[in-house]
Interface confidence: low
């Protein structure tokens, strides 16, 4: 049959780990990904699959900053396929394609549930600290955390209230660490969300499990 | 407070080379710095950033291989470098801490004349 | 990429507002920052993020930014607000710059 042309192309991504994902499923054809490089090469990825999503990672994270382009080819099952690298043609055309939309990683991926790993309520003051998590970010072989590759444009916002209440508050940080006045021999349930202030969309992740303070925590299990 | 102090104006001959600088006070590794020009008479040019913590940089398609911009993170220090100067390059070059579409702290410029 | 345009001229009688437009396809979907310069000085960041004010800039300078336009207001502007007003932003790993506009403060 006539490859149909992939539609609904969408980018999943949490923490630079980032599927392309489209629709429908091929039915006597194949896909191929091509994604460009920064020096606009296509490169080929996920070559004559059948699957309906493409993990691209590997090339995303070699410029977190920069503005990939992608698009997913409907490749015939029955003709002869030549791929020679930045090459994919059917006997001498290029295949339907769908572009993806634009994907700038720094911009547009999601940011993963925070946790917390450790806090302290001490007299009037209570410390929390929030793990700085690793992302498939790589520099020197090395996975670098969240806050090596957006430095100082991460912030977090924590959310608390008293056990016993209903009312919130919040405070911000551009740290990994919150040290927040609060009422002596009062216990504190709270989340943590991280954000980046740069962003226009996609600017906070998911809260982070709420915890609480010592004499709460036997009521939350 | 954040402040950026950028060397003195130069005036050239066309064919010679030059490199500017751009001293920052601040946590330098952990911000962008960005370059942008300034012809006489005109508007603001992006001409690319640097990321002094790993050097990483990137230009405008515009500037891409016309200049180098550079950074020594021991000193703080940020650099824009020309290695044959044109008469076209006379303009006023402001160095800026940068945050993708955002220049929120800037030096004061350094006027360069290229003149033969 | 984006393209920002701007009016290369506008004038306002001090006290009343003046508005500041630039326009680019699709901008309402971009972050957009306002720079103010004066002759002979530098640049400096009046609104960052559509309508967020920097510490020190007086809260007559405010930011909109939807559909294809942006547009910088200065309420009660004053003698002091002529210079040139720049408009930025962030697309397809380049930063754009408006051509500018020259605010005249008339009288």
């Known amino acids: 049959g006539i490859p149909e042309k992939a539609f609904n192309l969408t980018w999943i991504s949490t923490d630079f780990k980032t599927i392309l994902e489209w629709q429908p499923k091929p039915t006597n054809y194949t896909y191929t990904v091509q994604i460009s490089d920064r020096s606009r090469n296509w490169k080929n990825k996920c070559f004559s699959t059948t699957d309906t999503e493409c993990d691209l990672t590997d090339e995303i994270v070699k410029d977190v900053t920069w503005a990939y382009e992608a698009k997913v080819l409907s490749v015939p099952r029955r003709n002869s396929v030549h791929g020679d690298g930045d090459q994919l043609v059917i006997h001498g055309e290029e295949p339907p394609f769908t572009n993806a939309p634009k994907f700038l990683p720094y911009r547009d991926t999601n940011l993963g549930q925070p946790v917390i790993q450790q806090f302290e309520q001490n007299g009037r003051k209570l410390n929390v600290v929030v793990k700085d998590s690793l992302t498939l970010v790589r520099k020197n072989g090395t996975f670098l955390t969240l806050r090596q590759v957006f430095g100082k444009d991460l912030g977090y916002i924590i959310t608390y209230r008293k056990g016993s209440s209903t009312g919130k508050k919040t405070n911000i940080t551009n740290t990994n660490e919150f040290s927040i006045d609060v009422e002596e021999g009062v216990s504190y349930c709270f989340f943590v969300q991280a954000m980046i202030f740069s962003r226009k969309t996609n600017q906070n992740s998911p809260g982070s499990s709420t915890v609480c303070t010592e004499q709460w925590k036997s009521f939350l299990g | 407070q954040v402040q950026l102090v950028q060397s003195g104006a130069e005036v050239k001959k066309p064919g010679e080379s030059l490199k500017i600088s751009c001293k920052g006070s601040y946590s330098f590794t952990s911000n962008w710095i960005g370059w942008v020009r300034q012809m006489p008479g005109k508007g603001l040019e992006w001409m690319g950033w640097i990321y002094p913590s790993d050097s990483m940089t990137r230009y405008s398609p515009s500037f891409q291989g016309q200049v180098t911009i550079s950074a020594d993170k021991s000193i703080s220090t940020a650099y824009l470098q020309w290695s044959s100067l044109k008469a076209s390059d006379t303009a006023m070059y402001y160095c800026a801490r940068y945050l993708f579409g955002l220049f929120d702290n800037w030096g004061q410029g350094t006027l360069v004349t290229v003149s033969s | 990429d984006i393209e920002l345009t701007q009016p290369p001229s506008v004038s306002v009688a001090p006290g009343q507002t003046a508005r500041i437009s630039c326009s680019g396809d699709n901008l309402g979907s971009y972050y957009v920052s306002w720079y103010q310069q004066k002759p002979g000085q530098a640049p400096v960041l009046v609104i960052y993020?559509?309508?967020n004010r920097p510490s020190g800039i007086p809260e007559r300078f405010s930011g909109s930014n939807s559909g294809n336009t942006a547009t910088l207001t200065i309420s009660g502007t004053q003698a002091e607000d002529e210079a040139d007003y720049y408009c930025a932003t962030y697309d397809s790993s380049t930063d754009v710059f408006g051509g500018g506009t020259k605010l005249t403060v008339l009288g």
């Open positions: 993020n559509d309508n």
